[in-house]
Interface confidence: medium
């Protein structure tokens, strides 16, 4: 089954997820993997290089690249498809003669797959197709895995330990190198010294960009730094055993002097810049519930204080094939009810020291619009509406009907597809709106479908406030007020005048205002006034009145 694309180019968690780092998790470590092997420039190494005057240049590999692309995502940003790098473009390692910096603020060096890797190679040989962040084969961002000169082998199994890798490139390249893969799949260089090998490098050269893995012990809250070298090096003051420096406190610098019989003085002075403890960071879901159906917000929170410089901490996220380097990300225009996997990692001085993954299911979305089949009135006081339900999940319907300015709403069971409206007012236009809703993290209403009908006519109500007054001996003036409910299309007032059982007058006016003349004197009359709406007559209002004797 193919993954479901969202409007942002994310894919749902049904597809294989793309880890941030290329190496597998070491056995029995708790949650965090070593960072993938990146070729790095000297300025990104875990080192401060101190060189003697005789060592002022660095042999570099001459096959240069001049291709690069930079990601640009700043702030808490919405998803954009990033420009993908074709090659990592790290610069030549320097043994100290030249200085490398980034211009501008940290934000200008965004989302380099590894620090320095978006700097176009400007020296021969640094065609570093290093593992761009990430290198899982399913990722669209995958670049060819290079057998880097300094790839980290898988770390030994450690219970309750976290592996953190600080990778930089090996400054010194021997004349003859054999590249092999270690059991972990990482590249390892074994060097074979042959007649053409140059004279021994200084240890400062040889280990100029030694890579360091930091192992965090959650119980002791101390780090161990593992020096990624192929030979068992010696450390000044015996500070390391088996290429490991133990009991390092978070956020403290430690200086280690490294030497080996394969290299000459000066020794390599390695400054270990120890990261903060991993448990001081927590990945928090900051999604607003109102928007949880189409957005995801993730934010790293510092839940404890530490003394490391926070400016040296950078954050990376990968959700699907989208990559960001913000502390907080907001993904928008997602599909409701879909799972999205986001991997994140935190780097200290551009070296990963912790990561986390979250699978977030977006909330139920607003239901779709119901499809009204018909709505009509077949009687004066009744109406009917039938519909097809929307496709998406919902809990119930709300049916509202509006006459003039009055509005009534009903909650209807989700299984209903028809509703009979009762006690409607005759000959009245009703506007109906029907929407489905779902109660998720918040109630979400679907779009309303609208229809209208006019109820059938019915007899109007009685006229009221009828008066009969004598205007002369034989003339009467009959007036009344309109009915409260006309209940039909037309307006006509009727007056019937009876004497005994005989209809003596039958008049019809637009207004209820009748002047009845030439009546018999001294006679009892019955006056019946009623309203006719074009379809039905109303109940008559009846008054009795007598003419008087003629005054003459």
């Amino acid at each position: 089954q193919s993954p479901t694309p969202s409007p942002t180019g994310l894919t749902t968690a049904k597809m294989p997820s793309v880890p941030l780092s290329s190496d597998p998790l070491p056995t029995h470590t708790t949650a965090f993997s070593p960072a993938s092997t990146f070729e790095r420039e000297n300025d990104f190494s875990e080192t401060t290089t101190s060189l003697s005057p005789d060592n002022t240049s660095t042999q570099v590999s001459p096959d240069s690249l001049d291709n690069a692309s930079a990601f640009n995502t700043t702030g808490v940003s919405s998803v954009q498809t990033p420009h993908l790098p074709t090659h990592a473009d790290s610069q030549t390692p320097s043994a100290g003669t030249d200085t490398q910096t980034f211009s501008g603020s940290a934000a200008n060096a965004k989302l380099n797959p590894t620090p320095g890797s978006n700097a176009i190679s400007d020296v021969p040989g640094e065609r570093s197709t290093a593992s761009t962040f990430p290198t899982d084969p399913v990722s669209p961002l995958t670049t060819t895995l290079s057998l880097a000169h300094h790839s980290s082998a898988a770390l030994p199994a450690r219970t309750s330990n976290t592996t953190i890798t600080a990778n930089t490139s090996d400054a010194y390249l021997n004349a003859s190198e054999t590249t092999t893969l270690s059991p972990s799949g990482s590249a390892v260089i074994s060097t074979t010294t042959i007649a053409t090998t140059p004279s021994k490098p200084t240890c400062d050269e040889k280990y100029a960009n030694i890579t360091v893995d930091y192992l965090y012990n959650k119980e002791t809250k101390l780090f161990t730094a593992k020096l990624n070298v192929n030979e068992n090096v010696e450390c000044g003051n015996n500070t390391c055993t088996n290429n490991e420096v133990h009991n390092l406190t978070e956020c403290k610098n430690a200086s280690v002097s490294i030497s080996h019989n394969s290299c000459t003085a000066p020794d390599k002075t390695l400054i270990l810049d120890v990261p903060p403890g991993v448990e001081k960071f927590q990945l928090h879901d900051c999604t607003q519930v109102e928007k949880a159906d189409t957005t995801i917000c993730l934010k790293w929170k510092n839940i404890e204080t530490f003394t490391c410089d926070t400016q040296n901490i950078t954050y990376r996220f990968q959700c699907g094939n989208m990559i960001f380097d913000n502390k907080e990300i907001k993904l928008e225009n997602l599909e409701p009810e879909h799972e999205y996997k986001c991997d994140s990692e935190i780097l200290y001085n551009n070296h990963k020291f912790t990561n986390a993954s979250k699978i977030i299911k977006t909330d139920f979305g607003s239901p779709g619009e119901p499809q009204i089949i018909f709505c009509r009135s077949e009687a004066a006081h009744q109406g009917v509406i039938t519909w097809n339900p929307p496709q998406r999940s919902f809990h119930n319907f709300t049916l509202c009907y509006i006459k003039e300015t009055e509005k009534d709403c009903l909650n209807l069971d989700k299984n209903l597809i028809k509703y009979d409206l009762q006690n409607l007012k005759p000959y009245t236009k009703y506007v109906l709106s029907l929407h489905a809703y779902i109660i998720a993290k918040v109630q979400r209403n679907g779009s309303a479908a609208m229809c209208h009908f006019t109820t059938k006519s019915a007899p109007p109500s009685q006229v009221w406030n009828m008066t009969v007054s004598m205007t002369s001996d034989n003339s009467m003036h009959v007036k009344c007020r309109p009915p409260r409910d006309r209940n039909g299309p037309h307006e006509r007032y009727h007056l019937e005048v009876e004497a005994g059982n005989t209809l003596v007058r039958n008049e019809s006016h637009k207004n209820c205002d009748f002047r009845v003349k030439d009546l018999q004197y001294s006679t009892d009359y019955t006056f019946k006034a009623y309203f006719h709406n074009g379809d039905y007559p109303g109940e008559p209002f009846i008054l009795h009145h007598s003419t008087s004797y003629n005054s003459k």
């Epitope: 420039e41 096959d63 001049d66 060096a109 978006n118 700097a119 176009i120 400007d122 021969p124």
Partner: antibody, heavy 117, light 112 residues
């Protein structure tokens, strides 16, 4: 066609700073590094350093690292070099040059800087 | 730093003759990929440098076949056959194998 257009000549006093520009056109600015080279009157060429406009990554010749600041503006496809604390030693023509795979293939016309009190 | 040395030409060259310009590196510019990272430039009077030869012997686009480069890891020669008046200027060699990149001091060619 590829062109590198450098800003005009500068006359500055000792101790001052100057900032020159190199406007690139005719190619994708972010796909090549921009190199800077110094040539003192009647003398040879000296490599100052370069900037990768794509990432902002800079590498300096150690000799110039306290003298020069390189920047680039992707939106205007322009690279800049600022010289600070000028002395008479800084009087020279400064070239920007695009770096191809194995060579500096296109050069600007040069910006002349004269430091004089 | 790698030091690049260029010799001066003692006399102006007659138009139509051939001339060799030498360049020596303090360190081999042959890298393990088999390429030699030595480039030649010509800077005509009042102009910017122009690339002639790269990787020791490959002519740059648009450069006359009268120009050819050769050499070993440390000793290099730029050969100009049938010299023309337009060939006057200063010829520089440059190494790109190691930072900082360095140029030779230049060889001035005069044509009579």
């Amino acid at each position: 066609q590829v062109q590198l257009q450098q800003s005009g000549a500068e006359l500055a006093r000792p101790g001052a700073s100057v900032k020159m520009s190199c406007k690139a056109s005719g190619y994708t600015f972010t796909s090549y590094t921009m190199q800077w080279v110094k040539q003192r009157p009647g003398q040879g060429l000296e490599w100052i350093g370069y900037i990768n406009p794509s990432s902002g990554y800079i590498k300096y010749n150690q000799k110039f690292k306290d003298k020069v600041t390189l920047t680039a503006d992707k939106s205007s496809t322009t690279a800049y070099m600022q010289l600070s604390r000028l002395t008479s030693e800084d009087s020279a023509v400064y070239y920007c040059a695009r770096r191809g795979s194995y060579f500096f293939d296109f050069w600007g016309q040069g910006t002349s800087v004269t430091v004089s009190s | 730093d790698i030091v690049i040395t260029q010799d001066e030409l003692s006399n102006p060259v007659t138009s139509g003759e051939s001339v060799s310009i030498s360049c020596r590196s303090s360190k081999s510019l042959l890298y393990k990929d088999g390429k030699t990272y030595l480039n030649w430039f010509l800077q005509r009077p009042g102009q910017s440098p122009q690339l002639l030869i790269y990787l020791m012997s490959t002519r740059a686009s648009g450069v006359s076949d009268r120009f050819s480069g050769s050499g070993s890891g440390t000793d290099f020669t730029l050969e100009i056959s049938r010299v023309k008046a337009e060939d006057v200027g200063v010829y520089y060699c440059q190494q790109l194998v190691e930072y900082p990149f360095t140029f030779g001091g230049g060889t001035k060619l005069e044509v009579k």
